[in-house]
């Protein structure tokens, strides 16, 4: 109508998808009677009657809104349930009396998108690409209206940058009317981006205000050429013979280049390629002193066939040679003296010490051991240990046996053995001397001799316990070129009062196993009363 005031802006009603929109007819009483109102939806400038109010009673018109409209607030408000994105339009109420007036409402619909799904280029990005490559995608599904996307690198928003950064966003409309946004980040990356954290952020609006959702942070596989190659040895620190040593080639490129490890031949000074395992690691196990030398690594880029050489690395496998002792098999008379000398070579300074084998007692710190006024007890083992103090575990030893000339020497002079009549006894007798003695028994039985070491012998005798044997006892005699010596075993009959709770234990060097004469397989070790050992 000419001269009529311009239509006021529609009232804004904001609502989330799925909820109920309350459309309040804002006509004043002077503009119209709310008991007689028509409601319209306006889509593409076309009005469609959707609801009538007559005498305060509401009636839906057939069509898309038929099932979702109802009156509230004594007829002043129209409720639209289950709001969808398609409901985003203008609704107007029109009063019929006293004259036709209308009130317009703009319905705005919102839905938060799902969590953004970020995906990284599964093949990675080479730094030498000629143009920006697809780095990652960000998908925000089922939002309304279309959310805005912002890409971040290391917490800073990424801006479009000619030939460097390009963000390509597109959207699709689902059958529900909701939008799915896909954004592709294209960029030319540099080596430093290998550790960069990328994420995307979706910005969207709800009736409650502006919101955002962030994706997880991702790193992008970045490929860049090798510039430097170096060798790494494990374990670090001083190496010794016997260690497991790993020599590996490392490079600062991704993917790692193809490697080979070479060792300089000390005589020809030529580099000779070593055989590495499937992982390109040279494993020296056990490491030997021959593994010492100069190693280097060569790396090839298989695309360009350009090779890079590492700085050479000197490898030192520390060692101690076999230990030599002189004299090697010493023999001495009682009362004489002996000097034992120990020698060894090493890649480091050596420390020597002499230990008594039987007791591990340290006798001397140094390569020379002097023994004076030798007694029979001085016979036996002496161990020289050559060690590198700066490298724990690097040592070699040599054992030397000293023999003292002398007649046989018995482990015990006499011993009592508890027995039962008609049992088979297992008796043992031990003697030492130089030259090594032989042992004989004064009774018939099955005897067997065992050499314990060059100066010591153990004889065992199986004999049947008889009344005569109980009377006489048993003697063992040890003899060599320098004399003889005897031990006596007294046999005592066991009765029940003699046995103690630990009667199956043995003491001393002599074990006596008694078994019934009729049951050869059944053996029981009888208890011997402890006696002080007599020697000589």
């Amino acid at each position: 109508v000419p001269g009529e005031a311009e239509q006021p802006a529609p009232e804004l009603v904001e609502v989330e998808v799925g909820s109920t929109a309350l459309l309040k007819c804002g006509l004043s009483q002077s503009q119209g009677n709310l008991s007689h109102v028509d409601w319209f939806s306006v889509h593409k400038e076309k009005r469609t009657l959707i609801f009538r109010v007559r005498q305060g009673q509401g009636q839906s018109e057939p069509g898309e809104y038929e099932q979702r409209l109802s009156l509230q607030d004594r007829g002043a408000t129209l409720a639209l349930t289950q709001v969808t994105p398609q409901d985003e339009r203008i609704f107007l109420c029109q009063g019929k009396r006293p004259r036709s007036q209308e009130y317009r409402i703009q319905l705005r619909v919102y839905k938060a998108p799902e969590e953004p799904n970020i995906q990284v280029n599964p093949l990675g990005i080479p730094v030498n690409s000629k143009e920006p490559e697809e780095v990652a995608t960000c998908v925000g599904r089922n939002g309304y209206p279309i959310p805005q996307v912002i890409w971040y690198k290391n917490g800073r928003p990424l801006k479009e940058e000619k030939n460097r950064v390009h963000i390509q966003s597109s959207q699709t409309v689902e059958s529900s009317g909701l939008y799915t946004l896909q954004s592709i980040l294209k960029a030319q990356l540099v080596k430093e981006d290998k550790d960069a954290q990328f994420y995307c952020e979706l910005n969207y609006r709800l009736p409650s205000g502006n919101h955002m959702k962030e994706s997880r942070e991702v790193t992008v596989p970045v490929f860049y050429p090798t510039e430097k190659v170096w060798l790494e040895v494990e374990p670090v620190g001083m190496l010794k013979e016997g260690d497991r040593v790993e020599i590996r080639c490392l490079a600062d490129g991704n993917p790692p280049p193809h490697f080979s490890i070479s060792k300089q031949n000390p005589s020809t000074r030529e580099a000779e390629e070593e055989t590495t395992n499937d992982n390109g690691v040279l494993v020296l196990e056990p490491a030997r002193k021959e593994h010492s030398g100069r190693y280097e690594c060569q790396a090839w880029n298989l695309d360009t066939m350009i090779s890079l050489l590492s700085e050479p690395q000197e490898l030192l496998v520390n060692y101690v040679s076999d230990v030599r002792v002189s004299p090697a098999a010493p023999e001495r008379q009682e009362g004489s003296s002996l000097t034992l000398t120990c020698e060894a070579e090493s890649s480091q300074d050596l420390e020597f010490q002499w230990l008594r084998e039987e007791t591990d007692q340290v006798l001397e710190r140094g390569p020379v051991l002097q023994l004076h006024d030798l007694k029979r007890e001085a016979g036996g083992g002496y161990r020289c240990v050559a060690s590198v103090p700066s490298i724990p575990g690097l040592n070699r030893t040599q054992l030397v046996k000293l023999a003292i000339f002398g007649p046989p020497w018995m482990a015990f002079k006499e011993r009592k053995v508890w027995v039962k009549e008609n049992m088979v006894l297992n008796l043992s007798c031990e003697a030492s001397g130089h030259p090594r003695p032989t042992i004989s028994w004064n009774v018939n039985g099955t005897a067997s001799e065992q050499d314990q070491d060059p100066q010591r012998v153990l004889s065992t005798l199986n004999v049947l316990v008889t009344p005569e044997l109980l009377e006489t006892g048993v003697e063992c005699t040890a003899s060599n070129d320098l004399g003889k010596n005897t031990s006596i075993l007294f046999l005592e009959l066991v009765n029940l009062t003699t046995l103690t709770p630990d009667s199956n234990t043995t003491t001393g060097l002599s074990t006596s196993t008694a078994s019934p004469h009729t049951r050869a397989n059944s053996t029981s070790t009888e208890r011997k009363l402890p006696e002080p050992e007599s020697r000589g």
């Epitope: 995906q119 990284v120 599964p122 093949l123 690409s129 490559e133 697809e134 995608t137 592709i184």
Partner: antibody, heavy 116, light 106 residues
Framework: QVQLKESGPGLVQSSQTLSLTCTVS????????VSWVRQPPGKGLEWIAA???????YYNSAFKSRLSISRNTSKSQVLLKMNSLQTEDTGMYFC??????????WGQGVMVTVSS | DIRVTQSPSLLSASVGDRVTLNCKGS??????LAWFRLKRGEAPKLLIY???SLQTGIPSRFSGSGSGTDFTLTITSLQPEDVATYFC????????FGAGTKLELK
Amino acid sequence: QVQLKESGPGLVQSSQTLSLTCTVSGFSLTSNGVSWVRQPPGKGLEWIAAISSGGSTYYNSAFKSRLSISRNTSKSQVLLKMNSLQTEDTGMYFCARHRPFYFDYWGQGVMVTVSS
Amino acid sequence: DIRVTQSPSLLSASVGDRVTLNCKGSQNIYKSLAWFRLKRGEAPKLLIYDANSLQTGIPSRFSGSGSGTDFTLTITSLQPEDVATYFCQQYYSGYTFGAGTKLELK
């Protein structure tokens, strides 16, 4: 509409080089990457190589250095070369379009037989 | 390399059945998984991408679900034309495929 078509010799002698061509239509090779995938008889699918929209090339390390992928954007063709062929390389060879990281369109495939 | 394990390798079902195919990644691949249908003499067809997004033109009886390591392709009402071999593929790191599930009619 988007289409991909593989072509190449059906039969190749072992130790020879295989050359395959993937001719595309309905999209530009500067907008989408292309991958080659193969399926040996009675077996699963195996990714071989790819060329990105930006022209970067990628290879499956299992093929060592037997592969070469390239493209001719003006002819809308992606080429795959595989040398030192063995009988185990027999199978159906497919090319597929990237969108941008999954494969949304594939060719029908070309059967390659390696004879000894 | 990320391994993808598919199960079952063979599945017999009747027309109208609800069919479920499984795919398991050897590590977390988030939602970087696609499902394909492969018929002899035809180009492989993308059914599902991003684990649960239906490719344009694919009937709504197909749906995908899962995230992380465990994924499922469901056909709500099996049709005769669905007889094929189905493959899943991860594209989180490189490209690897499952060994396939052959779907046949009972």
